[in-house]
């Protein structure tokens, strides 16, 4: 639509230029043309002439009525048919919008990715509003009562430098548009409790040539957090079900985890960690694919695993791909075997 137009009259909208989707809407056109007593007043929506529900109120004014208007945006203009003029004469135009008041933002989560220097907060915005909606993130110290506000669209990154005065905060999100305002629940945040350790990466894997071949997976993180709890999940590329192993990790050295796996199979490994006792997990690491060696003797293989000496294994559980774990974009990467030597898989950052 045209936002600025030289009007020879006026156009107005009831209940207003921004209104709730599905409402009945009346649009009025009032001409103030010099040297014209219009025979007819016409309405156009998005450039197309309207035919129905037009009422001529008096000599200068007409109205068009829409029942249950449900288009998010439309450009309306009206024209006059002046005697002696070949073309219609423009009177005025207006952009109109319909939408919804915002839902209360939900599932507000704030985390600090280690070394990022930011607290990142995300939330669900709810159903589409179709109109300009802003989100204001409020961060209020539980100790000083000082409050800071940040304008956002779908998430916010707040420098931890601006959170120096306190460790405990209340965070909430206010959603505002022309049709309403809603608040999220208030989230009680302790900065020390929301740190997610620096990314964990599986660097390589090898399968030994022992009588009972074992696969050693090497993985690391640059985290400075001392007590870290991790999960490694693994499955064959043909399987839907993940096995999950849990570890207490100490990243002062590279972690090594031993697995007894089916021979001649392509396995996918992923790892994720959290600070021990805290609730926020890293996302799963990039899929790491490893091909186990070919079977040398006949035996029944049972996939099982044994932790390396540096780690404490709590449980091994089975999880199907369609489980509560967040969905992963599984990009399968090739692994090659060179002259029968143990194969290293590829990984992506």
């Amino acid at each position: 639509g045209i936002t600025s137009i030289n009007c020879s009259g006026d156009m107005w909208v009831e209940p207003g230029e921004i209104f709730q989707m599905g409402m009945n809407v009346s649009i009025y056109c009032q001409e103030a043309l010099k040297h014209c007593r219009p025979r007819n007043l016409y309405f156009y929506k998005n450039g197309f002439k309207e035919e129905f529900d037009i009422t001529r109120i008096n000599r200068t004014t007409a109205r068009i009525w829409y029942k249950g208007f449900s288009e998010p945006h439309a450009y309306m203009h009206c024209t006059a048919e002046c005697p002696g003029h070949f073309q219609e004469t423009l009177i005025c135009g207006k952009d109109i919008s319909s939408g919804h008041p915002p839902d209360a933002p939900s599932n507000l989560t704030c985390v600090i990715y280690e070394y990022s220097g930011n607290m990142t907060c995300t939330w669900n915005t709810g159903k589409p509003t179709y109109i300009d909606t802003k989100y204001i993130v409020h961060v209020k110290s539980l100790e000083t009562e000082e409050e800071q506000q940040y304008l956002a669209s779908s998430y916010v990154k707040i420098s931890t430098d601006s959170l120096q005065g306190s460790r405990k905060y209340l965070v909430w999100v206010q959603a505002v548009n022309s049709l309403g305002m809603e608040n999220s629940q208030q989230l009680h945040v302790h900065l020390d409790d929301i740190v997610i350790p620096s990314a964990s990466i599986i660097s390589r894997a090898e399968t030994t040539n022992d009588t009972v071949p074992k696969t050693i997976v090497y993985w690391k993180s640059k985290t400075m957090i001392e007590k870290v709890f991790c999960e490694m999940r693994y499955k064959t590329t043909t399987n839907q079900t993940w096995s999950v192993k849990e570890f207490d990790a100490n990243f002062t050295y590279v972690q090594q985890s031993e697995f007894y796996l089916e021979p001649d199979s392509k396995y996918v490994f992923q790892v994720r960690c959290q600070e021990t006792g805290k609730r926020n997990w890293q996302p799963w690491s990039s899929p790491f694919v490893h091909q186990t060696s070919q079977e040398t003797g006949k035996r029944n293989w049972q996939p099982w695993s044994s932790p390396f000496v540096h780690q404490t294994s709590q449980t091994v559980s089975q999880v199907t791909a369609k489980s509560s774990h967040e969905p992963q974009k599984m990009e399968m990467l090739s692994a090659t075997i060179f002259r029968g030597h143990p194969a290293s898989g590829n990984h992506q950052d």
């Epitope: 204001i136 409020h138 009562e145 409050e147 506000q149 304008l151 809603e182 608040n183 208030q186």
Partner: antibody, heavy 121, light 112 residues
């Protein structure tokens, strides 16, 4: 020390409008702060009208009874906050106070002296 | 959020210990302030963050509570303490349905 001085009160007819001013000194107008308006009808309690938050952006909040009729704004160059009151009624007769702590907290260390608004024909 | 203060009026004597309560309709953590107001004057901040004494306020005033229930206590009433007292929630004002952030007030008068 923060000082607040209200002005603009007086007698107004029902249906009329009035703009109150609150001139502030001693506030760091480049920092985050809340400035609020509170009123008190004769012999009644304190009634919150609304607040303006000034920081990296400006945000306003109103009591639900004040929405639509009352508008809070500010002029940073004059260190002044305004309360625009429209469609005034007899029950809007009150002493109007501006209040702040000079920072982004919502309790009020500093209050103006108040300005009386009388709505009567 | 609604703030309910009680009692609405209270008579006491100099030297008495006096307690005024304020209840919030939902959790406001420790975000509560107390004010004293004398006739013809602007209110004066006594307590903020539920229990912190404002500058220059005598130590006979104290505040306690968190969540929804709060108390203002004057340990030993002095003649200058006879006034009206208000509580105020200072949690958040971005709620679309706030009617008033103040309690209705407690008028403290001299007994007899």
């Amino acid at each position: 020390e923060v000082q607040l001085v209200e002005s603009g009160g007086g007698l107004v007819q029902p249906g009329g409008s009035l703009r109150l001013s609150c001139a502030a000194s001693g506030i760091d107008f480049n920092s985050n702060y809340y400035m609020c308006w509170v009123r008190q009808a004769p012999g009644k309690g304190l009634e919150w009208i609304g607040c303006i938050y000034v920081g990296s952006h400006v945000n306003t909040y109103y009591a639900n009874w004040a929405k639509g009729r009352f508008t809070i704004s500010r002029d940073n160059s004059k260190n002044t906050v305004y309360l625009q009151m429209n469609s005034l009624r007899a029950e809007d007769t009150a002493v109007y106070y501006c209040a702040t702590s000079g920072s982004s907290v919502l309790y009020f260390k500093f209050w103006g002296q108040g300005t009386l608004v009388t709505v009567s024909s | 959020i609604q703030m309910t203060q009680s009692p609405s009026s209270l008579s006491a004597s100099v030297g008495d210990r006096v307690t005024i309560t304020c209840q919030a309709s939902e959790n406001i953590y420790s975000f509560l302030a107390w004010y004293q107001q004398k006739p013809g004057k602007a209110p004066k901040l006594l307590i903020y963050s539920a229990s912190k004494l404002a500058a220059g306020v005598p130590s006979r005033f104290s505040g306690s509570g968190s969540g929804t229930d709060f108390t203002l206590t004057i340990s030993s009433l002095q003649p200058e303490d006879f006034a009206t007292y208000y509580c105020q929630q200072t949690n958040r004002y971005s709620n679309p349905d706030i009617y008033n952030v103040f309690g209705q007030g407690t008028k403290l008068t001299v007994l007899g």
